[in-house]
């Protein structure tokens, strides 16, 4: 019996997308690269439901985790890695007093019950996101794919 696996092994399915929560740590730019290497993107949050889901994943594991949000292009103007701006209705997710840009903090992370800005060169866990596969169109997607784990072997 063939089973539909909309996401690669070790990825989590939520509302039509697949998410990979890393088990190793990288800086923000290397986290972007790690996601690209597996055909994904450092997570861009598109809805309140998605935010709640991801925040829960991060807080449960008690990890500081990079998301695809920074103000590297222009200080104080937060932009997602897909080029879209941070909308005002999403600014509610910043932790109290954040973003504060203390010491050039230009990249956003999941921290506790909200978001925090931190230095982009710090190594943290990260979350990749890509669209889930549609099992009805392509038979190969009924097969369980080999693990796609964007974690480099230890140096």
């Amino acid at each position: 019996e063939r089973l539909c696996h909309p996401c690669p092994w070790e990825w989590t399915f939520f509302q039509g997308n697949c998410y990979f929560m890393s088990n190793s740590q990288r800086n923000w730019h290397d986290s972007i690269t790690a996601c690209k290497e597996v055909g994904a993107q450092l997570v861009v949050i598109k809805s309140a439901e998605e935010q709640n889901f991801l925040q829960l994943q991060s807080s449960r594991s008690n990890r500081f985790t990079w998301m695809g949000l920074s103000d590297l292009n222009q200080e104080g103007t937060w932009q997602w890695v897909d080029g879209s701006p941070l909308l005002p209705s999403f600014k509610q997710y910043w932790n109290r007093g954040e973003p504060n840009n203390v010491g050039e903090e230009d990249c956003a992370e999941f921290s506790g019950n909200g978001w925090n800005d931190d230095k982009c060169n710090l190594a943290k866990f990260w979350i990749c996101k890509k669209s889930a596969a549609s099992c009805s169109r392509d038979e190969e997607q009924f097969l369980s794919p080999a693990p796609a784990t964007p974690n480099p072997p230890p140096a």
Epitope: Q15, K46, S47, A48, E49, G76, T77, P85, L86, L87, P88, S89, K91, Q92
Partner: antibody
């Protein structure tokens, strides 16, 4: 109480630039969560969102009109200005400014100002 | 951009009728939806925000429900003052209005 009032020319010629002002009271655009937006409505048609500015001075524009729009605020005067370049007869509409609660829904609206584009 | 589709475009009803207007989003918007009422020559008036929260001062005969992509505005017992055009609006990704539903006298 919260009030908003739009002002600007009633008639604009094609290719000209439209400048509209929204004067508001009862809240401050420097307060966290406060946003003001411009929305228009051609005669007999639906509402169309144009632009929004928030308490951080971040600006957001309609994808289809962003090359023609500029939104700015003067917090000390409690005023908002929208400029729209290269006006065309299809831009004839009632233009509203409205407060957006935390950048979400529009809880207070001005009465609107009708702008006609004609030569 | 997210598209909002309202149905029906026009609705004929009588005083006392239960009226339901539907709004569909082209992608999931959680509960980030508002409903407005507009009368001719007037600015829109907020009725419902976050899909189901009643704005202060709005009569309790108005209610909203839904989440994700499907939403409804219900008027439990239509009153003479309710004949107007109703718009839904999403605020999950930028801001988009539906095309409107005109509620007219049957």
């Amino acid at each position: 109480q919260v009030t908003l009032r739009e002002s600007g020319p009633a008639l604009v010629k094609p290719t000209q630039t439209l400048t509209l002002t929204c004067t508001f009271s009862g809240f401050s655009l420097s307060t966290g969560g406060m946003c003001v937006s411009w929305i228009r409505q051609p005669p007999g048609k639906a509402l169309e969102w144009l632009a929004l500015i928030d308490w951080d001075d971040d600006k957001y524009y309609s994808t289809s009109l962003k090359t023609r729009l500029t939104i700015s605020k003067d917090t000390s005067k409690n005023q908002l200005v929208l400029t729209m370049t290269n006006m065309d007869p299809v831009d004839t509409a009632t233009y509203y400014c409205a407060r957006a609660h935390s950048g979400s829904y529009f809880d207070f609206w001005g009465q609107g100002t009708l702008v006609t584009v004609s030569s | 951009d997210i598209q909002m589709t309202q149905s029906p475009s026009t609705l004929s009803a009588s005083v006392g009728d239960r009226v339901t207007i539907t709004c569909r989003a082209s992608q999931r918007i959680s509960n980030w939806l508002a409903w407005y009422q507009q009368k001719p020559g007037k600015a829109p008036k907020l009725l419902i925000y976050k899909a189901s929260s009643l704005e202060s001062g709005v009569p309790s005969r108005f209610s909203g429900s839904g989440s994700g992509t499907e939403f409804t505005l219900t008027i439990s017992s239509l009153q003479p003052d309710d004949f107007a055009t109703y718009y839904c609006q999403q605020f999950n990704s930028y801001w988009t209005f539906g095309q409107g539903t005109k509620v007219e006298i049957k």
